[in-house]
């Protein structure tokens, strides 16, 4: 085997990784909240908006106590991948009205991507199961009108806000078990 190697290079402890993941999730939550408010100011929402292709909310806050670490991280990763795909679609096909949300929407996409990588790294460091992502869903159809794009944006940002809020609570609870 040869001589023992020198001191290994330092990388974050999984608990420190979880701390920074919580911080990143909180930051993303604040970004999403701000962007949703910006959207409401420019294009007031007339009631709740839904998009069938969005994931259903993972868990109520009351049910968090029963969660296990792999389940939380796996579900969170799957849901955030779906939201990433929707944000990419919104930027590409949302129409000229939504151009007013740039560059914030681009920043949101980049941070979402970073959070996904952080979650994957955490799962690797803990050696938790990492099931493959669901097979790619059929491409999202472009909005039927400018107003359709705005309604979709309300639904995406609203759903992402709820998911990230759940994620912060879930990750903080999991920290106590690690």
């Amino acid at each position: 085997p040869g001589p023992p190697p020198g001191p290994p290079r330092v990388s974050p402890d999984p608990r420190a990784e979880l701390d920074s993941t919580v911080l990143l999730t909180r930051s993303l939550l604040a970004d999403t909240r701000q962007l949703a408010a910006q959207l409401r100011d420019k294009f007031p929402a007339d009631g709740d908006h839904n998009l069938d292709s969005l994931p259903t909310l993972a868990m109520s806050a009351g049910a968090l106590g029963a969660l296990q670490l792999p389940g939380v991280l796996t579900r969170l990763r799957a849901d955030l991948l779906s939201y990433l795909r929707h944000v990419q679609w919104l930027r590409r096909a949302g129409g000229s009205s939504l151009k007013t949300l740039e560059p914030e929407l681009g920043t949101l996409q980049a941070r979402l991507d970073r959070l996904l990588r952080r979650l994957q790294l955490l799962m690797s460091r803990l050696a938790l199961p990492q099931p493959p992502p669901d097979p790619p869903a059929p491409p999202l159809a472009p909005p039927s009108s400018a107003w359709g794009g705005i309604r979709a944006a309300h639904a995406i940002l609203g759903g992402l806000h709820l998911t990230l809020d759940w994620a912060v609570r879930g990750l903080l609870l999991l920290k106590t078990r690690l």
């Epitope: 050696a127 199961p129 099931p131």
Partner: antibody
Framework: EVQLLESGGGLVQPGGSLRLSCAAS????????MHWVRQAPGKGLEWVAV????????YYADSVKGRFTISRDNSKNTLYLQMNSLRAEDTAVYYC???????WGQGTLVTVSS | QSVLTQPPSASGTPGQRVTISCSGS?????????VHWYQQLPGTAPKLLIY???ERPSGVPDRFSGSKSGTSASLAISGLRSEDEADYYC???????????FGGGTKLTVL
């Protein structure tokens, strides 16, 4: 300083058994998934097995499934690999590794030969 | 045969930039799983060089950089030095194994 120290390697006959140990220090052992990775003489790295931070998940490469068992004792900061029904092709340096893997031990040589 | 494909050898002269590729499939790298790179100096254990496609652990010089696109990844070493002569391995999670898969390794020679 992070340290992973493997022991238990040696010469064993085909069909025999060996138990490798890996003593960990300098980091929170119970927060890391742990791997065994091997390297046959002059060859590349081959992943062997992994165990989750709390021991609840264990996975094996097809080449060792049913013959090798990975386990850990978080109270002793120690990782184990029980190797049964050893074959000549199991001859390699066996490394224990933590995390991604982020940290590696210096390895212990297992030789399977008659 | 390795699940991740790397060129068996690469070479360069001191000061040069060298790139090592790592090609996977839709079941590992292409499914969004991150790529990690290891350096194994002669006679020693592997060391983590790059994690999560492009992140450098503390202590790793910024001459080393990683990137990922589609089903492949690459490691770039700029300002090549004689002490960079080593074997380099890429690795990625493979859900069918529930564990990491390694590339076959690339032997880097500094001429």
């Amino acid at each position: 300083e992070v340290q992973l120290l493997e022991s238990g390697g040696g010469l064993v006959q085909p069909g025999g058994s060996l138990r490798l140990s890996c003593a960990a220090s300098g980091f929170t052992f119970s927060s890391y998934g742990m791997h065994w990775v091997r390297q046959a003489p002059g060859k590349g790295l081959e992943w062997v097995a992994v165990i989750s931070y709390d021991g609840s998940y264990k996975y094996y490469a097809d080449s060792v499934k049913g013959r090798f068992t990975i386990s850990r004792d978080n109270s002793k900061n120690t990782l184990y690999l029980q190797m049964n029904s050893l074959r000549a092709e199991d001859t390699a340096v066996y490394y224990c590794a933590a995390g991604v893997p982020d940290y590696w031990g210096q390895g212990t040589l297992v030789t399977v030969s008659s | 045969q390795s699940v991740l494909t790397q060129p068996p050898s690469a070479s360069g002269t001191p000061g040069q930039r060298v790139t090592i590729s790592c090609s996977g499939s839709s079941s590992n790298i292409g499914s969004g799983y991150d790529v990690h790179w290891y350096q194994q100096l002669p006679g020693t254990a592997p060391k983590l060089l790059i994690y999560s496609n492009e992140e450098r652990p503390s202590g790793v010089p910024d001459r080393f950089s990683g990137s990922k696109s589609g089903t492949s990844a690459s490691l770039a070493i700029s300002g090549l030095r004689s002490e960079d002569e080593a074997d380099y391995y890429c690795a990625a999670w493979d859900p069918s194994l529930s564990g990491p898969v390694f590339g076959g390794g690339t032997k880097l020679t500094v001429l």
